[in-house]
């Protein structure tokens, strides 16, 4: 069982309390009330990609 | 085989208070989410309460907020619903369920029920 | 909360019969959708997951459909074992799941 604030969540995924495991944040555009989305949007999704260098 | 046994439930005065089992069988129990869904005589089903696989989150409806309490012993393979200030509308078969291992999305495994009957 | 309205609420079927359960949400809940059926007496057991997926062991006979708002159960040849009532359960919403009020299929 992961201790919150430990071990993060890979890029583009995020904690779920509700669920115990990480997340795919590619689900919260559809299902924005998950409680994990609130981390997604914190962090920019996997296949983010910066614009400059 | 897939089982959820219920029990605890019974006859209760109002304002009195009951504890259901839910013992969980024929599946390892602690990656699940669990919940409890309620069925008054007659009617429909309503959700009671959600809780995480470790524990660590749950969730109630706002009928019973304040009321009731949702635990697990993952030890035990046991689900609780500790239930307070029970009221005559609380009268209903109470449910077990098990979750799927994706976010609320679906509840394969049903108990057989236990009933509430809260009255004087 | 959302709310989940089935209809009919009732309706009578002969075996072999084509029957249609519709259930409509208050708002949009993408494919989060899922049915149930439950015989008296009986738990719930669940036949439709995702709007669309069969459960594993429910026959092929049963099938759902729709997104957004409407939604629909279809039973392609009713069955003696299928006279029950069917339940839509929106999981959208969380962690504020919502049943339909049930459609209670008779045998005519």
């Known amino acids: 069982e992961r201790v919150p604030g430990t071990t993060p969540c890979s890029r583009g995924s995020s904690w779920s309390a509700d669920l115990d495991k990480c997340m795919d944040c590619a689900s919260c555009p559809a299902r924005p009330h998950s409680d994990f989305c609130l981390g997604c949007a914190a962090a920019p999704p996997a296949s983010f990609r910066l614009l400059w260098p | 085989e897939v089982q959820l046994l219920e029990s605890g439930g019974g006859l209760v005065q109002p304002g009195g208070s009951l504890r259901l089992s839910c013992a969980a069988s024929?599946?390892?129990?602690?990656?699940?989410?669990m919940m409890w869904v309620r069925q008054a005589p007659g009617k429909g089903l309503e959700w009671v309460s959600y809780?995480?696989?470790?524990?660590?989150?749950?969730h109630y409806a706002d009928s019973v907020k304040g009321r009731f309490t949702i635990s697990r012993d993952n030890s035990k393979n046991t689900l609780y619903l500790q239930m307070n200030s029970l009221r005559a509308e609380d009268t209903a078969v109470y449910y077990c369920?098990?979750?799927?291992?994706?976010?609320?999305?679906?509840?394969?495994?049903w108990g057989q029920g236990t009933l509430v009957t809260v009255s004087s | 909360d959302i709310q989940m309205t089935q209809s009919p609420s009732s309706l009578s079927a002969s075996v072999g019969d084509r029957v249609t359960i519709t259930c409509r949400a208050s708002?949009?809940?993408?494919?989060?959708l899922n049915w149930y059926q439950q015989k008296p007496g009986k738990a719930p057991k669940l036949l439709i997951y995702?709007?669309?997926s069969l459960q594993s062991g429910v026959p092929s006979r049963f099938s759902g459909s729709g997104s957004g708002t409407d939604f629909t159960l279809t039973i392609s040849s009713l069955q003696p074992e299928d006279f029950a009532t069917y339940y839509c359960?929106?999981?959208?919403?969380?962690?504020?799941?919502?049943f339909g009020q049930g459609t209670k299929v008779e045998i005519k």
């Open positions: 369920a098990r979750g799927g291992d994706t976010y609320f999305d679906y509840f394969d495994y």
């Open positions: 024929g599946f390892t129990f602690s990656p699940y989410p």
């Open positions: 809780i995480s696989p470790s524990g660590g989150s749950t």
């Open positions: 708002q949009s809940i993408s494919s989060y």
């Open positions: 995702a709007a669309s």
């Open positions: 359960q929106q999981s959208y919403s969380t962690p504020g799941i919502t």
